[in-house]
């Protein structure tokens, strides 16, 4: 008999957590688990519970997490890693659309995230999408071209900036940009 199947690990309400706001990490295995172990990777820090409630997000809690569980003497495979990001660590960037936020279907638009600081990483979020578009960029501006725009691209976008040296410490979100596809 091999290792037990891996549990799932999720952050509620989101893995992007503003500083000082609460978040819950939940490790979900099968019923009747004897012991859970939730660990912060690249550290010696852990918790022996399925649920880790963080009452106020801090820089020191940002990072990669994973969990596993034990039944009898058997340990499960580890969960997929969860990246817990602290936002609001730095000032917000600005997000703009070129040539503009109103685009004809089939046209092209580029969303640009600009910051005064020398960040080399940018993430673009569309409201309602689970994951960001990440764009490593060497300069002070990150461009996210959207080629052949469709109605599915319409919505509210925000961007974040951060440094590859501290990849889990992000800026505050930019002001929202509403992309309208006509």
């Amino acid at each position: 008999s091999g290792p037990l199947p891996k549990p799932s690990l999720q952050a509620l309400p989101s893995s992007l957590v503003p500083l000082e706001k609460p978040v819950t990490l939940r490790c979900q295995g099968p019923p009747g688990v004897d012991l859970y172990r939730l660990e912060k990777l690249s550290s010696s820090r852990y918790q022996d519970q399925a649920v880790l409630f963080i009452p106020a997000m801090k820089r020191s809690l940002a990072g990669r997490y994973r969990c596993s569980y034990q039944n009898g003497s058997l340990w499960s495979l580890p969960s997929d890693q969860l990246e817990l990001v602290a936002t609001g660590v730095f000032a917000k960037p600005s997000l703009s659309a070129q040539p503009g936020p109103a685009v004809s279907s089939g046209g092209d638009v580029t969303l640009q995230c600009q910051t005064r600081y020398g960040f080399d990483q940018f993430a673009l979020y569309k409201e309602g999408d689970p994951a960001p578009y990440k764009n490593p960029e060497r300069w002070y501006r990150a461009s996210f071209p959207i080629i052949t725009v469709t109605a599915a691209h319409s919505g509210t976008y925000r961007c974040y900036s951060f440094s590859s040296r501290d990849p889990y410490l992000w800026s505050a979100p930019s002001d929202p940009l509403e992309l309208v596809v006509t």
């Epitope: 820090r45 852990y46 918790q47 022996d48 020191s60 809690l61």
Partner: nanobody
Amino acid sequence: QVQLQESGGGLVQPGGSLRLSCAASGFTLDNYAIGWFRQAPGKEREGVSCISSSDGRTYYADSVKGRFTISRDNAKNTMYLQMNSLKPEDTAVYYCATSPLYSDSDRCIWEEYDYWGQGTQVTVSS
């Protein structure tokens, strides 16, 4: 709002005792790592005592072993540091700290603590 508030510091003569308290609000200390740290003028912050592992093991810095005792009262949501036989070299600002994560470290590492009090001054002088 998450807060830690220390009390109990002050001026004490060498050989005297003080009991520092740290009251937590906005969360419960149960199942949290707890620690006391201190910083003397011109020196780095150092770990005095902590209970950082899930098995309740207690750590004390060599300089305070046998004189200081860390404890907690979950019902009062408060942690304590009982300090006896105080010496002039114990003079420092004392900070309580806590974390929702335990640690396998065999000492108190301040980077592993997430929530901090504002500090209370302890001065040992005749």
